[in-house]
Amino acid sequence: KFSKQSWGLENEALIVRCPRQGKPSYTVDWYYSQTNKSIPTQERNRVFASGQLLKFLPAAVADSGIYTCIVRSPTFNRTGYANVTIYKKQSDCNVPDYLMYSTVSGSEKNSKIYCPTIDLYNWTAPLEWFKNCQALQGSRYRAHKSFLVIDNVMTEDAGDYTCKFIHNENGANYSVTATRSFTVKDEQGFSLFPVIGAPAQNEIKEVEIGKNANLTCSACFGKGTQFLAAVLWQLNGTKITDFGEPRIQQEEGQNQSFSNGLACLDMVLRIADVKEEDLLLQYDCLALNLHGLRRHTVRLSRKNPIDHHS
């Protein structure tokens, strides 16, 4: 559960985030799992640890392997694993499946292609974009911040899109590329104001102290591919990542489902080892799209364990 696949190309920068997160003040130690050797933090090293991030500047094929990160707080340690694979650069234009990030779908009205993993890097706009290895040119293509917008999408726009950017580390520049497939759907859908199906508004969820608990935020947004629809959890009005409680984590990525033909998204909030103080928090399921934003609030209450009499 706390293991993450990461991949990159030799001679490019690769930055990996520890799958276990904590407050910025917590120390994070990194180890190469096979040898249990500590990863240095000095930036003069080609591979070094920087808090929650493990940096390969640049990466080499020999760096492949499993890396362990341990998030240390005054009261607990949390362990995560990063499974890193560095591949040799291909001589031809083909990008093999194992280098591809998740496929995105688009339509005439929805044609954003996000550059994968870019938020981990120190980069400056503009991004360079390529389709099937050809640099994209023409007014139909617009590189905007971390994504590419294609105007008047046609079926011929389907293909593999590569973003290329420069990571800067202490004045040194490293190239990074990432590729994902883009498919074009015939859009006969519609979108509407988010409708949160779960949890119910002001729901009280019973949990057992010391056990794990899951909360699911589920919302529907319309029919067909949905543009900029998202669901997420907030704790006491702040983002989960900003709240800084490592026991409480949002699942990475949103799961898409279809309910009565409607496009829905859900996001699971996992609370490990439920504590008394978790009962005092307010958990907000937030759903938003181009129409607006909706919230439902949940609170936790203690479930009394059933007494077992002999």
């Epitope: 911040k145 938003l288 607006g292 934003l293 919230r295």
Partner: antibody, heavy 122, light 107 residues
């Protein structure tokens, strides 16, 4: 020091257009959501429009939907409100306001400009 | 849309008085509530957010409380500069909505 300076207000006939601008300084403009709020003479505050820091999300009040468009130019640290098909009931002081949080959805406004008056009258 | 109802619409008080303004939401808004102060001819100023968090630089005589549908702004000891109009605002759902205002006047 955070500063927001609105401009572009004035007298316009019903059905006309205006473009309001808000020049921002003293903070990292591109990191924050921004909003427009208006206040008709002698009346209360009415939220008009908000835009997320990345420009993905642009929300408008029902009273202006389809007529007003919010946008931003991070390279110029400027927020805009394009107002078309203006009505007499759009007469108000228009305030530009900065989101109090990196998160667009917090909705709190921690710094406001001094406002620009828009008068719609024939 | 969520309606915000403030009471009273106006009140008269003296310097040193304890003043309480209430704001009621037409549906639960958790703690997504802010309070603003506005003086004539000036822009509004954020006082309290998340129902009870004091904005940086705001005097500690201002406090906020409440959750769900009922909220309160309290000024523990009214000062001359506090005579102004106050607004509550919800940001639980879009559209964000404001209360109709409470004017605090000198008795």
């Amino acid at each position: 020091e955070v500063q927001l300076l609105e401009s572009g207000g004035g007298l316009v006939k019903p059905g006309g257009s205006l473009r309001l601008s808000c020049a921002a300084s003293g903070f990292t403009f591109s990191s924050y959501a921004m909003s427009w709020v208006r206040q008709a003479p002698g009346k209360g505050l009415e939220w008009v429009s908000s835009i997320s820091s990345d420009s993905y999300y642009k929300y408008h009040a029902d009273s202006v939907k389809g007529r007003f468009t919010i946008s931003r130019d991070d390279s110029k640290n400027t927020l805009y409100l394009q107002m078309n098909s203006l009505k007499t009931e759009d007469t108000a002081v228009y305030y530009c306001a900065k989101g109090a949080d990196y998160d667009f959805w917090s909705g709190y406004l921690d710094y406001w400009g001094q406002g620009t008056l828009v008068t719609v009258s024939s | 849309d969520i309606q915000m109802t403030q009471s009273p619409s106006s009140l008269s008080a003296s310097v040193g008085d304890r003043v309480t303004i209430t704001c009621r939401a037409s549906q639960g808004i958790s703690s997504y509530l802010a309070w603003y102060q506005q003086k004539p001819g000036k822009a509004p100023k954020l006082l309290i957010y998340r129902a009870s968090t004091l904005q940086s630089g705001v005097p500690s005589r201002f406090s906020g409380s409440g959750s769900g549908t009922d909220f309160t702004l309290t000024i523990s000891s009214l000062q001359p500069e506090d005579f102004a109009t106050y607004y509550c605002q919800q940001s639980y759902n879009t559209p964000w909505t404001f209360g109709q205002s409470t004017k605090v006047e000198i008795k």
